[in-house]
């Protein structure tokens, strides 16, 4: 059965997936797809990495962590109800039938109605992702996400809040992790 994760409409969703590279920089291809993991690949692929880089992605999907260290957790920007469903993270370990696959269920809840807008506390939205594609991805450099009006003090505050809340550790603890090598 799938592990369940939740987000509200308009927020960024986070789907954790990790592996431990056998050696620094010794990366393994990874794909993310919408739909449960099939026997090969990732259903409808939304993002993928190769041994060096993110080489394909679609709008609103990115890797916010350090994928070169095995953090291949998926961020989905500005989710809608249509983003609900099962997602597949597949660690494509070379060899005979070595793939590791994880099904993660994303549940999107309607946004809470609040009298006044609250400050965006999602640290993942604070920085755009600048990626130049390789291989099969779009040819041009894309900026995924938007850069909010934010100053260095706010960035520092957000970083401290993230560290203090131990959110990163909590998310890592709840995610799928495998060790390679």
């Amino acid at each position: 059965s799938e592990v369940e994760y939740r987000a509200e409409v308009g927020q960024n969703a986070y789907l954790p997936c990790f592996y431990t590279p056998a050696a620094p920089g010794n990366l393994v291809p990874v794909c993310w797809g919408k739909g449960a993991c099939p026997v090969f690949e990732c259903g409808n692929v939304v993002l993928r990495t190769d041994e060096r880089d993110v080489n394909y992605w679609t709008s609103r999907y990115w890797l916010n962590g350090d994928f070169r260290k095995g953090d291949v957790s998926l961020t989905i920007e500005n989710v809608t109800l249509a983003d609900s469903g099962i997602y597949c993270c597949r660690i494509q370990i070379p060899g005979i039938m070595n793939d590791e696959k994880f099904n993660l269920k994303l549940v999107i809840k309607p946004a809470k109605v609040t009298p006044a807008p609250t400050r965006q506390r999602d640290f993942t939205a604070a920085f755009p992702r600048m990626l130049t594609t390789r291989g099969h991805g779009p040819a041009e450099t894309q900026t995924l996400g938007s850069l909010p009006d934010i100053n260095l003090t706010q960035i520092s505050t957000l970083a401290n809040e993230l560290r203090d809340s131990r959110l990163a550790n909590d998310l890592r603890d709840s995610g799928a992790t495998i060790r390679i090598g």
């Epitope: 739909g35 099939p38 026997v39 090969f40 692929v45 070379p94």
Partner: antibody, heavy 122, light 107 residues
Framework: EVKLVESGGGLVQPGGSLRLSCAAS????????MAWVRQAPGKGLEWVAN????????YYLDSLKSRFTISRDNAKNSLYLQMNSLKAEDTAVYYC???????????????WGQGTLVTVSS | DIQMTQSPSSLSASVGDRVTITCRAS??????LAWYQQKPGKAPKLLIY???TLAEGVPSRFSGSGSGTDFTLTISSLQPEDFATYYC?????????FGQGTKLEIK
């Protein structure tokens, strides 16, 4: 036009070896997983093996993985099946088939070769 | 292994008939199901993939439905060229497995 052409079949004695080849054309070979599927005379279809885009990952029917090896040469647009220690029950038509592509989505063997007959008999 | 069970094993029908073939998976395969048509001495031909998507060049009288464990292939109005053997196949679990086939014969 997508074309898959198998070769290398024939009559072989039990315990012998054969290497099947599949020449692909009409599509970007390195963008697709490829497969071998076999069909014994008068029987149904049985999956044999799959290989990913660059050959780094392979997948087999458990009962065959110690004797069969799937491989590919993207520079030659070719798929191979090395079959060792052949048994009478390996007698079948062997088909090469194109499987899922780089972006996923289409899960089915969209194109098949005409097949090559392997007969294992003394 | 995921077992695929087709029914019926054989079926007699006439040109113009509506025909339904079912396929049941022993485990949830979501929508990772394909249907093939095979004529004697020929390679199989993909009809439907992802349970309900018509493959390129396949006439619209063919349709697929279902998800999870129960799937159906329907031919809305049989044509003479449709008499053949039909197979379902799952792409969810390893090993990939096929149904045993349904032979569609002329009544």
């Amino acid at each position: 036009e997508v074309k898959l052409v198998e070769s290398g079949g024939g009559l072989v004695q039990p315990g012998g070896s054969l290497r099947l080849s599949c020449a692909a054309s009409g599509f970007t070979f390195s963008d697709y997983y490829m497969a071998w599927v076999r069909q014994a005379p008068g029987k149904g279809l049985e999956w044999v093996a799959n290989i990913n885009y660059d050959g780094s990952s392979t997948y087999y029917l458990d009962s065959l993985k110690s004797r069969f090896t799937i491989s590919r040469d993207n520079a030659k647009n070719s798929l191979y099946l090395q079959m060792n220690s052949l048994k009478a029950e390996d007698t079948a038509v062997y088909y090469c088939a194109r499987d899922v592509g780089y972006y996923g989505g289409n899960y089915g063997f969209a194109y098949w070769g005409q097949g090559t007959l392997v007969t294992v008999s003394s | 292994d995921i077992q695929m069970t087709q029914s019926p094993s054989s079926l007699s029908a006439s040109v113009g008939d509506r025909v339904t073939i079912t396929c049941r998976a022993s485990d949830n395969i979501y929508s990772y199901l394909a249907w093939y048509q095979q004529k004697p001495g020929k390679a199989p031909k993909l009809l439907i993939y992802n349970a309900k998507t018509l493959a390129e060049g396949v006439p619209s009288r063919f349709s697929g439905s279902g998800s999870g464990t129960d799937f159906t292939l329907t031919i809305s109005s049989l044509q003479p060229e449709d008499f053949a053997t039909y197979y379902c196949q799952q792409h969810y679990g390893s090993p990939l497995t096929f149904g045993q086939g349904t032979k569609l014969e002329i009544k």
